[in-house]
Amino acid sequence: IPVIEPSVPELVVKPGATVTLRCVGNGSVEWDGPPSPHWTLYSDGSSSILSTNNATFQNTGTYRCTEPGDPLGGSAAIHLYVKDPARPWNVLAQEVVVFEDQDALLPCLLTDPVLEAGVSLVRVRGRPLMRHTNYSFSPWHGFTIHRAKFIQSQDYQCSALMGGRKVMSISIRLKVQKVIPGPPALTLVPAELVRIRGEAAQIVCSASSVDVNFDVFLQHNNTKLAIPQQSDFHNNRYQKVLTLNLDQVDFQHAGNYSCVASNVQGKHSTSMFFRVVESAYLNLSSEQNLIQEVTVGEGLNLKVMVEAYPGLQGFNWTYLGPFSDHQPEPKLANATTKDTYRHTFTLSLPRLKPSEAGRYSFLARNPGGWRALTFELTLRYPPEVSVIWTFINGSGTLLCAASGYPQPNVTWLQCSGHTDRCDEAQVLQVWDDPYPEVLSQEPFHKVTVQSLLTVETLEHNQTYECRAHNSVGSGSWAFIPISAGAHTHPPDEFLFTP
């Protein structure tokens, strides 16, 4: 640690005195202290001399000697008082700038330590301090206002009692700045704008911050617009608002508008797009396929996106058949606005019944006219199967009817024993029918197919099974002959086992 000579913590001298402060260290040493006049500095290797042959009250202050090469950063200090009867204060600053809730040091340095008992802090022109001003005093450093508030931004003077009268220092302006968390907050209204040529439009760009020092501007396609600024202060925030009013818009007004605000912390910007159109428009679309297939009993939401300007004058969902004249319940229709010009309309169809298959249309109207978007809803069903024994052209034939959607595939199985369903171990023979006959195939209905299996002799103790399957599921019907005998028997001699 460097050593200062004279080796005293404080030195009191009179104006005009010669002061020599010597600092010695192991390596090179440096003096630091408040910039003030008349000092001469002389360095010689490991010592440095700070001297003046004409000390003034302005030399009052703490002088510190450091050894730059010392890794521990040790230092020594001495406080010099230049005791001037006419000047009790050496004020080191015209202005003190701090952030809110920091301690504000007003550097009024007493030039005579004897005066410490009679010091006080006042506002200029003798006004008392604001209520709740918490402060302390150090003769070496001055007055500290603890946890300074924005409202305490005032001009202050330090007062000392000399010979029964108060002697004031020159004033110090305290500027307490609001802590700026970041760039100003921004709003640009509206977020999107559409107008028909000739209509009026308004775009409002506003920025706010706890500190008044910020700039805001509105630009159109990278060109800064000259707009008068309105300023306000409320909710402890400064607000600056730019309002662009357009009486009759034209195509050149269209494009990108950016609201930009900046302060010492940085810059914020937000943008919106202004579209100018020739006439009203109404567009309907869906992200879904307009042809929908859903399994019976399940639910479906039909969604339509609407893009329109001006706004909608009416809209509704309609069921167009073919099964009944029922209409969708209004409670199942839902409208959500994505933004000013885009809306989503949803029709919820829970637990779909067979009678609810068909066409659903969404209709909307604005000054641009009517538009409609129609969905076709087909229900999927697992196959239903039935088998009968009959004679076709004199031949005994098993006839399988399968009904479902999508169109079912048919497979015949012959297996040993009497069973409700053939398992792998029992299977004797399998026949696939690649092209069953389509009996009925109407829109929104099940598809019914028929498959024939010609059997010369119904084998005793065997089962004939017709299986049908589609993407939804499968169904089957087992046919069990009760007695075997002649090649042909009337159907009523047999038992049908579904």
Partner: antibody, heavy 117, light 110 residues
Framework: QVQLQESGPGLVKPSETLSLTCTVS????????WSWIRQPAGKGLEWIGR???????NYNPSLKSRVTMSVDTSKNQFSLKLTSVTAADTAVYYC???????????WGQGTLVTVSS | QSVLTQPPSASGTPGQRVTISCSGS????????VNWYQQLPGTAPKLLIY???QRPSGVPDRFSGSKSGTSASLAISGLQSEDEADYYC???????????FGGGTKLTVL
């Protein structure tokens, strides 16, 4: 070795505010005085003002009404604000460390600020 | 208009001794110490002399400073081509309560 680096916009419009920041690296901003000095093209140096780590400031009387300096010890930065700028404020702006005996031992490399519309 | 007065230019040949003057008043040079700065082209000023005649470490002893009354001077002996730069004097000014600079002297090494 103390290092100083000025930063801020290189172009400011007349009547607007010039804002610059000086970042001190390799060394602490505390217990030293820090100054701003400017130099118009082809001209001499002009002291603008100084700030101490506690926020104490002194300004050149010719600029006092337009200058504010502040310090952020947590970021090891100090800053300059000069309001209502004119073309006469176009200059290279330097930040520097000021020592007792009134000398500037460390300087930033300088940043050119042009005032123009 | 600078508070301290310097000649706008000076020149010398390599090896020569050159002196740059700086004139002030009682409120600055007359009562306070003088510092000198060297500014090489396109760079920031660098402290050359402080407290009238003190050299910071790293400054060659070819550079020396002196003060008399309200004037000061910077002498460069054994002039070298790398000494070609602008030189500024500075001092505390009691009326300004801060530092003032000279207008600068452009030194050319011929």
């Amino acid at each position: 070795q103390v290092q100083l680096q000025e930063s801020g916009p290189g172009l400011v419009k007349p009547s607007e505010t010039l804002s610059l920041t000086c970042t001190v690296s390799v060394g602490s901003i505390s217990s030293y005085y820090w100054s701003w000095i400017r130099q118009p093209a082809g001209k001499g140096l002009e002291w603008i003002g100084r700030i101490y780590a506690s926020g104490s400031t002194n300004y050149n009387p010719s600029l006092k009404s337009r200058v504010t300096m502040s310090v952020d010890t947590s970021k090891n930065q100090f800053s300059l604000k000069l309001t209502s700028v004119t073309a006469a404020d176009t200059a290279v702006y330097y930040c520097a460390r000021e020592r007792v005996g009134i000398y500037f031992d460390y300087w930033g490399q300088g940043t050119l600020v042009t005032v123009s519309s | 208009q600078s508070v301290l007065t310097q000649p706008p230019s000076a020149s010398g040949t390599p090896g020569q001794r050159v002196t740059i003057s700086c004139s002030g008043s009682s409120s600055n040079i007359g009562s306070n110490t003088v510092n000198w700065y060297q500014q090489l082209p396109g760079t920031a000023p660098k402290l050359l002399i402080y407290s009238n005649n003190q050299r910071p470490s790293g400054v060659p002893d070819r550079f020396s400073g002196s003060k008399s009354g309200t004037s000061a001077s910077l002498a460069i002996s054994g002039l070298q081509s790398e000494d070609e730069a602008d030189y500024y004097c500075a001092a505390w000014d009691d009326s300004l309560n801060g530092p003032v600079f000279g207008g600068g002297t452009k030194l050319t090494v011929l």
